[in-house]
């Protein structure tokens, strides 16, 4: 019988008492084979973290700063359940740390030196740790003691709780730096008042502060937010303009063997029986003998943290950067305006080799990071381990939901002004063998299908979106008799046709021979009935253009396209016989790297792009003999996006809507994790 006990860690006598009450009340409402609570008392949160890591306890609820400590080695804990605030319909699990300024003040985030600052309090998250952590490398040296460096950075501050004797500049705007509400500029509302009164130029608070202090929209319109990309936005656009997104209060557990499902089962049942307004005799979110015991008194319930979400992703790049800067105190030698090398994310072995060659030829401008799947690459870009990669539109959607931005688009048509003219897109098509003359769009059920990969545009999102509208369910593996859709569950019939050996079978990378456009077409040639690819795939792999043994004798005339009206047409008639127009692949990055990725990639394509005529000895960025490594092989150039610089604008309303509809069929654990952070 598996042990269904969750050992909760308590950090005080009062918490231990509440924990025992929690244990006893859960016993009275949960069947004997259900989860139960045991209580472990420790002296501090850090002791609880260590106890969980050592398997002496299982769970504790922590604020964001401690979630960071819990994640660090050797603890390696992960977030498993989040408290939420507000309503069940609109649950808030995060708040946003923001920098508020007056509308007419005219400076940006990178011009804060010499300004007057208002803080909620020394050592507090939104008011000190996050802004000072993010500004850390701009502070004058020596950066220790930190208070002195901050005092020398701003021309005057109010940082309640600071030592006014040692650091008088930190108390210049609020004499005495009182550490309670007796100081009119203390806390969130106080820091905002400091700005409002004209004492300071910028207030570091949380996103709700301005709404709580100014009920009138006209009054709020006198203020703006400073964004990390050195722009400003209205105060209600805090989701797109903040210093960091911070989780409020989170249950953590071990990453391996951490009982996360059991902890969720326990807390989910606990909130059903003892949550807000559920029971008089015991209340989960109430602390008669103290404040915020075990859980925050202001919490309204719990939400399960998606399993794909580790602490780094949960806390977010900006928060982790800020806290790491403060804790480790390391900065690059001399901060310069020059761009650091761009860390390109390469998928598996073959892309890594091409990336390495690019790195050697770029003489240090490009560095390479490897991952096994596109989603792993996106996650690495999110957390700063990598900076950029080029993605199919379906993954541009996921990357966008995860906060990344498109920066350049692949262009596939030769034109005089390639880099200035992003194209409308390519065509997603369904290809069949000419010999299978009875096959049409309307009788694909039970046939064998070949897909570039799950989540990709031409190979999945477009055909499966159209199919979903027809069959109204997500069981595509039952619709087709078998197929190869790399990235499917290994036991799915949509992995049956794949050719990868061992663990590489059905993997969404080049280790699976039927991966990508060329792979899906090869799958059709060798085993399948229909391949979902781009309109250029057939001509690129027939007529001797692909020298590989399986392709060298293929003839374009032996293949036809399925049209949505139930007819068929020759391959060259794709403009009148396609499933949909697909957005071109695009390079994505984090917002903070946008300018540098843009600059370095434009330099790189001038050196190694389509202007290189002999690829036998020279490095060619857009060539890999039909393997589409790093970029599509038919890329002519990387084009500026102009104003299409968000994933929604880049992909277009129609495609975003189509992928949104297919979301209910999504198996993307990353998309689930990212929509948890930003629903």
């Amino acid at each position: 019988v598996p042990d269904k006990t969750v050992r909760w860690c308590a950090v005080s006598e009062h918490e231990a008492t509440k924990c025992q009450s929690f244990r006893d009340h859960m016993k009275s409402v949960i069947p004997s084979d259900g989860p139960s609570v045991a209580c472990v008392k420790k002296a501090s949160y850090l002791d609880c973290i260590r106890a969980i890591a050592a398997n002496e306890a299982d769970a504790v609820t922590l604020d964001a700063g401690l979630v960071y400590d819990a994640y660090l080695a050797p603890n390696n804990l992960k977030p498993v359940v989040a408290e939420f605030y507000g309503s069940k319909e609109d649950p808030q699990t995060f708040y946003y740390a923001v920098a508020v300024v007056k509308k007419d003040s005219g400076f940006q985030m990178n011009q804060l030196r010499g300004k007057k600052s208002c803080h909620t309090g020394l050592g507090r998250s939104a008011g000190w740790n996050i802004p000072i952590g993010l500004l850390y490398c701009d502070l004058p040296e020596p950066r220790k003691p930190l208070e002195k460096a901050v005092a020398n950075f701003f021309s005057g501050s109010c940082a309640p709780c600071a030592d006014g004797t040692d650091f008088p500049q930190l108390c210049q705007l609020c004499p005495g730096c009182g550490c309670s509400t007796l100081n009119q500029y203390f806390g969130y509302s106080g820091a905002f008042k400091c700005l409002k009164d004209g004492a300071g130029d910028v207030a570091f608070v949380k996103h709700s502060t301005i709404f709580e202090n100014l009920a009138n929209k006209a009054d709020r319109d006198q203020y703006e937010l400073l964004c990390l990309d050195n722009t400003r936005k209205p105060v209600d656009e805090y989701k797109d303009c903040h210093l960091a997104q911070v989780p409020s209060h989170t249950v953590v557990a071990r990453s391996m063997g951490g009982k996360e499902d059991l902890i969720w089962e326990l807390l989910n049942q606990a909130q059903e029986h003892f949550g807000k307004d559920k029971s008089k005799e015991f209340q989960l979110f109430s602390s008669p003998h103290g404040k915020d015991l075990l859980f925050k008194d202001s919490a309204h319930g719990f939400l399960k943290v998606p399993p794909r979400m580790d602490a780094k992703m949960y806390l977010g790049y900006e928060y982790v950067t800020a806290i790491r800067n403060l804790r480790e105190g390391t900065c690059p030698e001399a901060p310069t305006d020059e761009c650091k090398p761009v860390k390109w994310c390469a998928l598996s072995h073959h892309e890594r080799l091409k990336c390495d060659e690019w790195s050697v030829n770029s003489v240090g401008k490009i560095e390479c990071v490897s991952a096994e799947t596109t989603e792993d690459c996106i996650a690495k870009i999110m957390n700063g381990e990598a900076d950029a990669m080029s993605l199919d539109g379906g993954f541009v959607y996921i990357a966008g939901k995860c906060g990344l931005v498109p920066v350049l688009a692949e262009n596939y048509n030769k034109s005089d002004n390639c880099e200035d003219t992003p194209e409308a897109g390519y065509f997603a098509i369904a290809v069949v063998k000419k010999s299978a003359s009875d096959l049409t769009w309307d009788n694909l059920k039970g046939k064998k299908s070949c897909h570039t990969a799950v989540g990709r545009t031409a190979g999945w999102n477009i055909p499966m979106g159209l199919l979903y509208n027809k069959i109204n369910h997500c069981r595509f593996d039952e619709f087709f008799s078998e197929g190869c859709a790399p990235g499917s569950k290994k036991d799915s019939s949509l992995c049956k046709l794949c050719m990868g050996s061992g663990l590489n079978l059905c993997e969404p990378n080049n280790k699976e021979g039927y991966y990508g456009y060329t792979g899906a077409f090869r799958c059709l040639v060798e085993k399948g009935d229909v391949a979902f690819v781009k309109h250029q795939t057939v001509p690129q792999n027939t007529g001797g253009k692909n020298p590989d043994p399986w392709a060298k004798n293929l003839n374009e005339k032996d293949y036809e396209l399925l049209c949505l009206d139930g007819t068929r047409k020759p391959v060259e008639e794709y403009a009148n016989c396609h499933l949909a127009r697909a957005p071109n692949h695009a390079v994505v990055t984090r917002k903070d790297k946008e300018a540098c990725v843009h600059k370095i990639l434009r330099q790189q394509q001038h050196l190694f792009g389509s202007n290189v005529t002999d690829c036998s000895g020279n490095f060619c960025l857009f060539r890999s003999e039909t393997k589409d490594l790093l970029f599509r092989d038919d890329t002519v150039c990387l084009a500026k996006l102009h104003d299409r610089n968000t994933y929604e604008k880049y992909l277009g309303e129609e495609y975003v809507k189509a992928v949104g509809n297919l979301r209910k069929c999504s198996t993307s654990s990353l998309l689930e994790a990212c929509t948890f952070r930003r629903p």
């Epitope: 073959h350 030829n361 000895g617 490095f619 890999s624 393997k627």
Partner: nanobody, 117 residues
Framework: EVQLVESGGGLVQPGGSLRLSCAAS????????MAWYRQAPGKGLELVAG???????NYRDSVKGRFTISRDNSKNTLYLQMNSLRAEDTAVYYC???????????WGQGTLVTVSS
């Protein structure tokens, strides 16, 4: 068929030096970017140093200032001079010729470098 034969490995004490060679045949050596990779026990393959056809070089951070990559196009040979060797440099070293274009996987048998006192 490309053939790459590495030599020059051996056992050396920390702080010591070795010079690895890689003889290439059947490749378009003189116009290809070349590189040295290594694989430590239980670890993945990692790029150590690379050299372009024009002689521009690039090194992984941990070997910068200690290792030097060079090529002799007349002899179709690639070299890696390794100085101030450390225990963490212990690995099998392979050379590769990028003209094979990333997926034919032409690798030699490698040469083992062991740094130990």
């Amino acid at each position: 068929e490309v053939q790459l034969v590495e030599s020059g490995g051996g056992l050396v004490q920390p702080g010591g030096s070795l010079r690895l060679s890689c003889a290439a045949s059947g490749s378009i050596f003189s116009i290809a970017t070349m590189a040295w990779y290594r694989q430590a026990p239980g670890k993945g393959l990692e790029l150590v140093a690379g050299i372009t056809r024009s002689g521009s070089t690039n090194y992984r951070d941990s070997v910068k200032g200690r290792f030097t990559i060079s090529r002799d196009n007349s002899k179709n040979t690639l070299y890696l001079q390794m100085n101030s060797l450390r225990a963490e440099d212990t690995a099998v070293y392979y050379c590769t010729d990028y003209s094979s274009r990333y997926y034919h996987d032409y690798w030699g048998q490698g040469t083992l470098v062991t740094v130990s006192s």
